[in-house]
């Protein structure tokens, strides 16, 4: 079938980077500037993606492949092919409808993106808290109290966590 089609359809001979120009007796014409065709046999070339505003060019458009964008510093990509850019927050914060907000007490975020997550509940695994959690870090769970045999050197308990307050932005 493919061979029959190629005999009947001269456009199938047009390689990537060209289009089958109906205005010129179906001659294979190069894609115009700022356009591309990534497969052969195309009757049109696609417009190149433009990386503007918060987007910056990661890979230039060529006659055979679209441009690729990423985000300007202070933002990170969301969606397939970096279709959106989302503002970074600081560690210990999450992006809300009102901007970057500190994680509530009992939650943390160790990245510049994403949401604040609850501290691990060590007691669910029968363990004790070895290091207290912060807005930026999860708690560290230690051995269960039963694992500490009499006379064994115990870990000095960490200082009590300070009362959470809004740190200066």
């Amino acid at each position: 079938f493919e061979r029959t089609r190629s005999l009947q359809d001269p456009c199938s001979n047009c390689p990537a980077g060209t289009f089958c120009d109906n205005n010129r007796n179906q001659i294979c014409s190069p894609c115009p500037p700022n356009s591309f065709s990534s497969a052969g046999g195309q009757r049109t070339c696609d417009i190149c993606r433009q990386c503007k505003g918060v987007f910056r060019t990661r890979k230039e458009c060529s006659s055979t492949s679209n441009a690729e964008c990423d985000c300007t510093p202070g933002f990170h990509c969301l969606g397939a092919g970096c279709s959106m850019c989302e503002q970074d927050c600081k560690q210990g914060q999450e992006l809300t409808k009102k901007g970057c907000k500190d994680c509530c007490f009992g939650t943390f975020n160790d990245q510049k993106r994403g949401i604040c997550r609850p501290w691990t509940n060590c007691s669910l695994d029968g363990k004790s808290v070895l290091v207290n959690g912060t807005k930026e870090r999860d708690v560290v769970c230690g051995p269960s109290p039963a694992d500490l045999s009499p006379g064994a050197s115990s870990v000095t308990p960490p200082a009590p966590a300070r009362e959470p307050g809004h740190s200066p932005q």
Partner: nanobody, 122 residues
């Protein structure tokens, strides 16, 4: 073709005020959410403020209570009233169509102006 043209930037002393304007054309301004962003010298872009078509407004923490975003749909114009300006507000300010309606998020189909420079210095 969508066009956004900012104006109103300039040199102002700390504590002073400026009003930026963004003239929009080529799309239905009244039903579009709009936003302002800024880029300080040598720094990354920062989301500043946004306004929904219905008038709900959003601000980043550092400009809250000092900046006011507004719109005049009859003039297809977006505004940013900036009061109590500080040296750290020095930046190129951009007007942008805001299709995602999400704080701090823009999409590839959103359009941007060329920017206007605001310098706060004594």
């Amino acid at each position: 073709e969508v066009q956004l043209l900012e104006s109103g930037g300039g040199l102002v002393q700390p504590g002073g005020s400026l009003r930026l304007s963004c003239a929009a054309s080529g799309f239905t301004f009244s039903s579009s959410a709009m936003s302002w962003a800024r880029q300080a010298p040598g720094k990354g872009l920062e989301w500043v403020s946004g306004i929904y078509s219905g008038g709900s407004t959003y601000y980043t923490e550092s400009v809250k209570d000092r900046f006011t975003i507004s719109r005049d749909n009859s003039k297809n114009t977006l505004y940013l009233q900036m009061n109590s300006l500080r040296a750290e507000d020095t930046a190129v300010y951009y007007c942008a169509k805001w299709g995602t309606l999400r704080f701090g998020v823009w999409a590839e189909y959103d359009h941007w102006g060329q920017g206007t420079l605001v310098t706060v210095s004594s």
